[in-house]
């Protein structure tokens, strides 16, 4: 069966910086991932990016950067310039679209407990979209 | 006909600030992002950055960020784009354009807005 | 930030030849480019979008290929109103970055 999964991980040097990991387990190729915060995509969620593994990608703040880093693996850099750090109680969703298997989203925060540079253990919630 | 219909040219001094506009028709607003890209006399494009006229959401070359603004207006289906402390690095001809979310390109630009800074 | 490189700024060709315009990219960019023609004192108009896919209405003239890091626009059967200037575009990552475009003179 695929997997989603998420990491947070709080940058050490910079409380305000964040980063996403969302990787998918499974076969198949996968057509686009989709990277929300606040809650699933369409669901609640507000859109932080759109991957396309050939395509390239789009962004809306407070992404800073997004990029591929594997062919089943994305990572999201996020930058809040305020003195507060919003990110820190924030559910993080990631779904990927893949063929033939559908899509599957996963959603991840940072817990309370985690120092700075420590990234949370993968946290799937799989949620199966028949698209 | 699908067209992005600029505002026209400005003459502004060193230090003020300028809000162009971009108005849409022929076409679901909503269903597209605007970008806006840059083009210095004689010289090559940079891209700005771009607005989701649905949430607002925007994203922004950091070269730019602090120098433009970019919001929508949904009812009168316009992007805006304000630039802040000008100086004369800001003098171009500037034009927003439409990105089709689905193919990922820009498929149809505006007329342009040439903005001079000079005092 | 990615450097898209086109090494040609001018080039000159008479109507009816065929000249093909690159374009490199610093790094992979897949298939995430689009071509992009400038006509003197106009907007400009998109004629090929990731790599090698026509823009509507564009003439079977212009065609687009490449990937990974090397791209190319290659132009046949040249008509005086390819006069242009014609740039590259990727959007890979952010931000998205043009190539410095290359002066298409048509004797």
């Known amino acids: 069966t695929p997997e989603v999964w998420v990491q947070v991980q709080m940058e050490a040097t910079e409380l305000s910086s964040f980063t996403v990991h969302c990787g998918f387990l499974g076969p198949g190729s996968i057509s686009l991932v989709t990277v929300s915060w606040g809650g699933p995509d369409g669901a609640g969620g507000t859109k932080l990016a759109v991957l396309h593994p050939e395509l390239g990608t789009r962004q809306w703040a407070p992404a800073r950067q997004a990029r591929w880093e594997t062919q089943s693996s994305i990572s999201l850099a996020l930058e809040d310039s305020g003195a507060s750090s919003p990110f820190a109680n924030t559910t993080f969703c990631c779904k990927f679209a893949s063929f033939p298997e559908g899509s599957w989203e996963s959603c991840g925060s940072l817990p309370p407990s985690s120092d700075p540079g420590l990234s949370a253990p993968p946290t799937p919630v799989p949620i199966l979209r028949a698209d | 006909e699908v067209q992005l219909q600029q505002s026209g040219p400005e003459l502004v001094k060193p230090g003020s600030s300028v809000k162009i506009s971009c108005e849409a028709s022929?076409?679901?607003?909503?269903?597209?992002?605007v970008d806006w890209v840059k083009q210095s006399h004689g010289k090559s494009l940079e891209w700005i950055g771009a607005?989701?006229?649905?949430?607002?959401?925007?994203s922004y070359n950091q070269k730019f960020e602090g120098k433009a603004t970019l919001t929508v207006d949904k009812s009168s289906t316009t992007a805006y784009m304000e630039l802040r402390s000008l100086t004369s690095e800001d003098s171009a001809v500037y034009y927003c354009?439409?990105?089709?979310?689905?193919?990922?390109?820009?498929?149809?630009w505006g007329t342009g807005t040439t903005v001079t800074v000079s005092s | 930030d990615i450097v898209m490189t086109q090494s040609q700024k001018f080039m000159s060709t008479s109507v009816g030849d065929r000249v093909s315009i690159t374009c490199k990219a610093s790094?992979?960019?897949?298939?995430?480019v689009d071509w992009y023609q400038q006509k003197p004192g106009q907007s400009p108009k998109t004629l090929i979008h990731?790599?090698?896919n026509r823009h509507t209405g564009v003439p079977d003239r212009f065609t687009g290929s490449g990937s990974g890091t090397d791209f190319t626009l290659t132009i046949s059967n040249i008509q005086s109103e390819d006069l242009a200037d014609y740039f590259c575009?990727?959007?890979?990552?952010?931000?998205?970055?043009f190539g410095g475009g290359t002066k298409l003179e048509v004797k």
């Open positions: 575009l990727q959007h890979w990552n952010y931000p998205y970055t």
């Open positions: 354009a439409r990105w089709v979310n689905n193919d990922w390109y820009f498929d149809v």
């Open positions: 990731s790599a090698s």
């Open positions: 790094q992979n960019v897949r298939s995430a």
């Open positions: 607005i989701n006229p649905n949430d607002g959401g925007t």
């Open positions: 022929g076409f679901t607003f909503a269903d597209y992002n």
